[in-house]
Interface confidence: low
Amino acid sequence: QEEDLPRPSISAEPGTVIPLGSHVTFVCRGPVGVQTFRLERDSRSTYNDTEDVSQASPSESEARFRIDSVREGNAGLYRCIYYKPPKWSEQSDYLELLVKESSGGPDSPDTEPGSSAGPTQRPSDNSHNEHAPASQGLKAEHLY
């Protein structure tokens, strides 16, 4: 019988209220044996995958998604999900990132190019159904 996958957790370092221009790292944690962690933004249609998974403890693996220079548009809801063959987990709870405005900062787009919070390319809208089960159409090679 297949094991039940525990829900992942999500946290942010150094916190969830980040000054404009500072860095933030989202940390997704799950059980050992995770192949892929995914950080989802606002809805399932926007996400980033990583297979750069490390062991946080003997019973826990983690992945880190860093935004080097947080901008106003990075504010929003984030959550994690992971793939441990042959199944995708449930989503974590949402974590809300707040960005503290600073005078004179640019009103900015929603994510840094090259940052970890958004993939470099999107899945095509034709082939990706945001409301489909998480196991559909989500292999990393579909992104790049």
Epitope: D42, G73, T120, R122
Partner: antibody
């Protein structure tokens, strides 16, 4: 299939008003920012306005040339975006495009076919 | 506000030639630059985003590059379907201004 369909263009006198509409379909509308871009006959593209999603409190942004005259708004329940244009000037004559912003990589990735606005007496 | 200065305004070239279009930003836009192609009577389409990344389905003869605040779009071995107008646009801060455009015509 992602589609953006503009309507509401036409002939209007200087100082008049017009409201453009954009009907979106084929994507989760409420998570995307939408822009209006215009193109005067035989000229280049001009960015006009942007409205972001609920998660950013529907923040709006405008080109200096239309500030205080144009208002962008949206109705997520209907997947619609609007551009209310007041105090129109002859230089506002253009094709107006409704465009989706893709925040993965910041490009205007889906464009409507445009609606033509002519401001003339 | 960031201004985008695009050159040349027009360009005549033959099929098979290589051409380069440039946009200079008046400030640092941190590679938040997109290139579009527009055919006569049609809506624009994305060619390159983040200054250097080719949009899905765009032929590899197109490439984007940057040097400081100068951004370039290079088209190798021009094909008949490449003729039209090209625009850059920055996304660093509002207003998200476009370059003035380059009309690429067949010689």
């Amino acid at each position: 299939e992602v589609q953006l369909v503009e309507s509401g263009g036409g002939l209007v006198q200087p100082k008049g008003s017009l409201k453009l509409s954009c009907a979106a379909s084929g994507f989760t509308f409420n998570t995307y920012a939408i822009h209006w871009v215009r193109q005067a006959p035989g000229k280049g593209l001009e960015w006009v306005a942007r409205i972001r999603s609920k998660s950013t409190n529907y923040a709006t942004y405008y080109a200096d040339s239309v500030k205080d005259r144009f208002t962008i708004s949206r109705d997520d329940s209907q997947s619609m975006v609007f551009l209310q244009m007041n105090n129109l000037k002859t230089e506002d004559t253009a094709m107006y495009y409704c465009v989706r912003e893709n925040w993965y990589y910041y490009a205007l990735d889906y464009w409507g076919q445009g609606t033509s606005v002519t401001v003339s007496s | 506000d960031i201004q985008m200065t695009q050159s040349p305004a027009s360009l005549s070239a033959s099929v098979g030639e290589t051409v380069t279009i440039t946009c200079r930003a008046s400030g640092n836009i941190h590679n938040y630059l997109t290139w579009y192609q527009q055919k006569q009577g049609k809506s624009p389409q994305v060619l390159v985003y983040n200054a250097k990344t080719l949009e899905d389905g765009v032929p590899s003869r197109f490439s984007g590059s940057e040097s400081g605040t100068q951004y370039s779009l290079k088209i190798n071995s021009l094909q008949p379907e490449d003729f039209g107008s090209y625009y850059c646009q920055h996304f660093w801060s509002t207003p998200f201004t476009f370059g003035s455009g380059t009309k690429l015509e067949i010689k």
